[in-house]
Interface confidence: low
């Protein structure tokens, strides 16, 4: 807390200029009108001040709005938005995508900071979901973004918002949260043939059920080993071995190199070793000949 | 407009047969999975049997397996339900509803039942 | 066979309230997970797919989330026609198996 002083005669701030670097944080504090650096908050960030002498301008802004700052005044925030606690932010109400970029430039190059987690959070939250054009932004700025939030937050994405997702953005997600997002990638991509379709649903694949599996199997795909290593081990399971084959295309001999790995290991366990042989890779640990085979599996493919 | 309508309920003794068939319009019946679902009196929703697109993929519930037959005739547009050695407890309403269908080489059951028939209403009683 | 259990099996409300109805599977369906509201003498009519999905038509006040094993089906401000019976229906696994459903009655 900043003592209250009076202001030095001829010391009273007439505008937010340079000139208030050489100010001493009492002086910021008596002679700059907390209503005049609400209106000319853009200039604040164009001015070298110190972190104490920000603490100062703070002080007087949640002194003047101690229900919250209005969007006006936290667009222009700038590197002041550094000195908001998260429990500043929850009061907030920002509902332009253009506040949300502004204040992620101030951060951009670090982490994501508690502050910059509750600002999307409110901001999220006073939309009602995660469209595409705040998704673009966001991931813009946070590849990782997508994959922080939990799979709850993720029922909230509307399909139409998946456009916006790239391969990277998914690098970190884990199985529950592509349960979440396959689906939608699934109604978002819905209109598109063949290829084109594949190329997009790749990097959802993680979430997909067997029975889609088996569908892209007869399209020719010819999925990449990297993108079969991050398929769901009990949606592999029950793929045939002429369904796998079908499904790598020419990537099918690199099973080999990843046959001691989930979910090839688990894959091959399920398998009958004649019909591994047919693939004449070498690949071991199938079910030998004249051994029952229970079908443990409850799907049927139904398209 | 599309459309479900069943037909060929009726009041049947048990051990007896049935078939009920369901007429679709509006829509390219031969590329969607279809279903058929069943409400008893007062009580809950049960599915009962599903077939692809293609006739050879069919499934059924634990309940009605070995008794009941579902098949389609993509040339009449219809789904039928053979019901045989029929039982009290297979006194319901009988619904036929169609899969969502909603991207490419879809396996359709996964996404919900969005066009269902009026039902047609089975009784077995002796 | 996945068993599924919804939570009221029936409850009361008033025009304008925002009511929770929740779904609870035995094991992991994913997100494949839907909603329906059925009236007396009806057929069911799908509100909410995969979870989250919004059925084309289906009023903005109905809403869905959840994923693994936990669901909820929400209506933000209850409609005078929105007094039905609301089902859960799981279409991960075969065979597919409903909830018993929740009775939502005027107050």
């Known amino acids: 807390e900043v003592e209250k002083t009076a202001c030095p005669s001829g010391k009273k701030a007439r505008e937010i200029d340079e000139s208030l670097i050489f100010y001493k944080k009492w002086e910021l504090e008596a002679c700059v009108d907390a209503a005049l650096l609400a209106t000319q908050m853009d200039r604040v960030n164009a001015i070298p001040f110190t972190y104490e002498q920000l603490d100062v301008l703070k002080h007087k802004l949640d002194e003047l709005y101690p229900q919250g700052y209005p969007e006006s005044v936290i667009q222009h925030l700038g590197y002041l938005f550094l000195k908001m606690s998260p429990e500043d932010i929850r009061k907030w109400n920002v509902t332009s995508l253009e506040t949300l970029k502004a204040l992620l430039e101030v951060n951009k190059g670090h982490e994501m900071s508690p502050q910059v987690a509750t600002l999307i959070d409110r901001f999220v939250k006073g939309r009602g979901q995660l469209d595409k054009d705040t998704l673009d932004t966001l991931t813009a700025f946070y590849p990782g973004y997508l994959c922080s939030l939990s799979p709850e937050e993720l029922s909230s994405v509307p399909p139409s918002s998946i456009w916006a997702v790239r391969p990277q953005d998914l690098d970190t997600c884990d199985p529950r949260q592509l349960d979440v997002l396959y689906p939608k990638a699934r109604l978002a991509f819905q209109n598109m043939n063949g290829s084109e379709y594949f190329v997009k649903i790749q990097s959802f694949l993680g979430g997909a059920p067997t029975e889609d599996l088996k569908a892209l199997s007869q399209q020719n795909v010819s999925m990449d080993l990297a993108t079969f290593m991050k398929l769901r081990t009990d949606a592999v399971l029950p793929l045939t071995v002429a369904e796998v084959q079908k499904l790598l295309g020419p990537h099918v001999e690199g099973l080999k190199a990843e046959e001691r790995h989930r979910p090839v290991r688990d894959w091959i366990l399920r398998q009958r070793q004649d019909d591994l042989d047919t693939l004449g890779l070498g690949l071991q640990g199938g079910i030998p000949n004249g051994y029952l085979v229970l079908d443990l599996s409850m799907q049927e493919a139904l398209s | 407009q599309v459309q479900l309508v069943e037909s060929g309920g009726g009041v049947v003794q048990p051990g007896r047969s049935l078939r009920l068939s369901c007429a679709a319009s509006?829509?390219?019946?031969?590329?969607?999975?279809m279903h058929w679902v069943r409400q008893a009196p007062g009580k809950c929703l049960e599915w009962v049997a599903v077939?692809?697109?293609?006739?050879?993929?069919?499934n059924y519930a634990e309940s009605v397996k070995g008794r009941f037959t579902i098949s389609r005739d993509n040339s009449k547009n219809t789904l039928y339900l053979q019901m045989n050695s029929l039982r009290a407890e297979d006194t319901a309403v009988y619904y036929c509803?169609?899969?969502?269908?909603?991207?490419?080489?879809?396996?359709?059951?996964?996404?919900?039942?969005?066009?269902w028939g009026q039902g047609t209403t089975v009784t077995v009683s002796s | 066979e996945i068993q599924m259990t919804q939570s009221p099996s029936s409850l009361s409300a008033s025009v304008g309230d925002r009511v929770t109805i929740t779904c609870r599977a035995s094991?992991?369906?994913?997100?494949?997970l839907n909603w329906y509201q059925q009236k007396p003498g009806k057929a069911p009519k799908l509100l909410i797919f995969?979870?989250?999905s919004l059925q084309s038509g289906v009023p903005s006040r109905f809403s869905g989330s959840g994923s693994g094993t936990d669901f909820t089906l929400t209506i933000s401000s209850l409609q005078p026609e929105d007094f039905a019976t609301y089902y859960c229906?799981?279409?991960?696994?075969?065979?597919?198996?409903f909830g018993c459903g929740t009775r939502l009655e005027i107050k």
């Open positions: 509803a169609s899969a969502l269908r909603i991207a490419v080489a879809a396996s359709y059951y996964y996404y919900g039942l969005d066009v």
């Open positions: 995969t979870a989250s």
């Open positions: 094991q992991s369906v994913r997100s494949f």
């Open positions: 077939i692809g697109s293609r006739e050879s993929n069919k």
């Open positions: 509006g829509f390219t019946f031969s590329s969607y999975g």
């Open positions: 229906q799981q279409s991960y696994e075969m065979p597919i198996t």
